[in-house]
């Protein structure tokens, strides 16, 4: 399977709330031996691979916003610590994955990247992430809802797959 | 803050089998994304990859010793254990217990426990 | 099995000294790749991860570069508390192998 980010680049004005986007493409197993591994973190843009250093998002490591199913069953973060930082992750049946962030901040701003890890018995984790930007605005030239931009067919497809 | 504590028997005979215990505190064995692993490291040489087990009870072990190693835990006990069969005078050494986090590499370890095997 | 090959072995240096070593993966691991530092008769503890990302709490001085086959460990300006052993590891797939060490030495 491959992870796509329908959008690279989330453009919201400060207090707005914004729901960052990725989503599994390819046949993914439903078997009884694998479990799939969700989360995201923010990161740097690497000169040489994005998204390998893992940051914080508003304080909340990886860990604490990972998500952990089989197949393409849905889940959800219930976590109080998560929701007491206006954050939420989600993955619902058709392979869509997300974080909601409420209540923007300009310190929100800069790269996000969503992590898939596809965990078998007896196998080697097959890993994917996806990257994608968000800036957030003040002022006069602040949209007065998030603008999002389309990733190029080329980068969605071109995911990094380790 | 998470703690790793290895126990057991430091001196195993020939062809016995070499058992340990990892007890962890600050943390819940059970915890999902993680998993728990163990590394050995003879004296005065290099460290060697065991085996881990996932939060989920998946098994992940080094094939030069597969035929002879089972890692399990006691979620009861919050504990990981680690049992190595046949063992001979090449097993002697410093055992680790260590848990990484999924796509991550050992981010913390215990302090070691040093098995002999000696007739 | 991927091999990981560590050079030097070992190495001489002096407080202040720019120390760099090195790791080569006998086939492409990316960017998943470990370094730890071991001081005598302690557990290894985690310097960098990603091939160079540095682990919470550890000193700038530490960084680490490299993807593929290709890494390496730098410490800009060593410190007494940093002659210790060294070792990579990558964790790309299993098994999970480590290089055999780097003993870095007080000159």
């Known amino acids: 399977f491959k992870v796509a980010t329908p959008y690279s680049l989330y453009v919201c004005p400060e207090g707005q709330n914004v729901t960052l986007t990725c989503r599994l493409l390819g046949p993914v197993d439903k078997g009884h031996d694998v479990t799939f591994y969700k989360t995201w973190y923010r990161s740097s843009r690497g000169e040489v691979q994005t998204c390998s250093e893992r940051r914080p998002i508003r304080n909340l490591t990886f860990q604490d916003l990972h998500l952990h199913h089989g197949g393409h069953q849905a889940a959800n973060t219930s976590h109080d610590l998560a929701q007491r930082h206006g954050l939420e992750s989600a993955s619902d049946h058709h392979g869509n994955f997300s974080i909601t962030m409420r209540n923007l901040t300009l310190l929100d701003s800069g790269l996000y990247c969503c992590l898939v890890v596809e965990i078998r018995h007896h196998h080697s984790e097959h890993r994917v992430h996806g990257a994608m930007e968000l800036q957030v605005q003040t002022g006069k030239d602040a949209p007065s809802n998030c603008v999002v931009y389309p990733s190029s067919s080329q980068d969605s497809e071109n995911i990094t797959a380790a | 803050q998470l703690q790793l504590q290895e126990s057991g028997p430091g001196l195993v005979k020939p062809s016995e089998t070499l058992s340990l215990t990892c007890t962890v505190s600050g943390g819940s064995i059970s915890s999902s994304g993680y998993y728990w692993g163990w590394i050995r490291q003879p004296p005065g040489k290099g460290l060697e990859w065991i085996g881990s087990l996932y939060s989920s009870g998946y098994t992940y072990y080094n094939p030069s010793l597969k035929s002879r190693v089972t890692i399990s835990v006691d979620t009861s006990k919050n504990q990981a254990s680690l049992k190595l069969n046949s063992v001979t005078t090449a097993d002697t050494a410093v055992y680790y217990c260590?848990?990484?986090?999924?796509?991550?590499?050992?981010?913390?370890w215990g302090q070691g426990t040093l098995v002999t095997v000696s007739s | 099995d991927i091999q990981m090959t560590q050079s030097p072995s070992s190495l001489s240096a002096s407080v202040g000294d720019r120390v760099t070593i090195t790791c080569r993966a006998s086939?492409?691991?990316?960017?998943?790749l470990a370094w730890y530092q071991q001081k005598p008769e302690k557990a290894p503890k985690s310097l960098i991860y990603a091939a160079s990302s540095l682990q919470s709490g550890v000193p700038s001085r530490f960084s680490g570069s490299g993807s593929g086959t290709d890494f390496t460990l730098t410490i800009s300006s060593l410190q007494p508390e940093d002659f210790a052993t060294y070792y990579c590891?990558?964790?790309?797939?299993?098994?999970?192998?480590f290089g055999q060490g780097t003993k870095l030495e007080i000159k």
């Open positions: 260590a848990r990484h986090p999924v796509a991550m590499n050992f981010d913390d």
């Open positions: 590891q990558q964790y790309n797939s299993y098994p999970y192998t």
């Open positions: 086939q492409g691991i990316s960017s998943w």
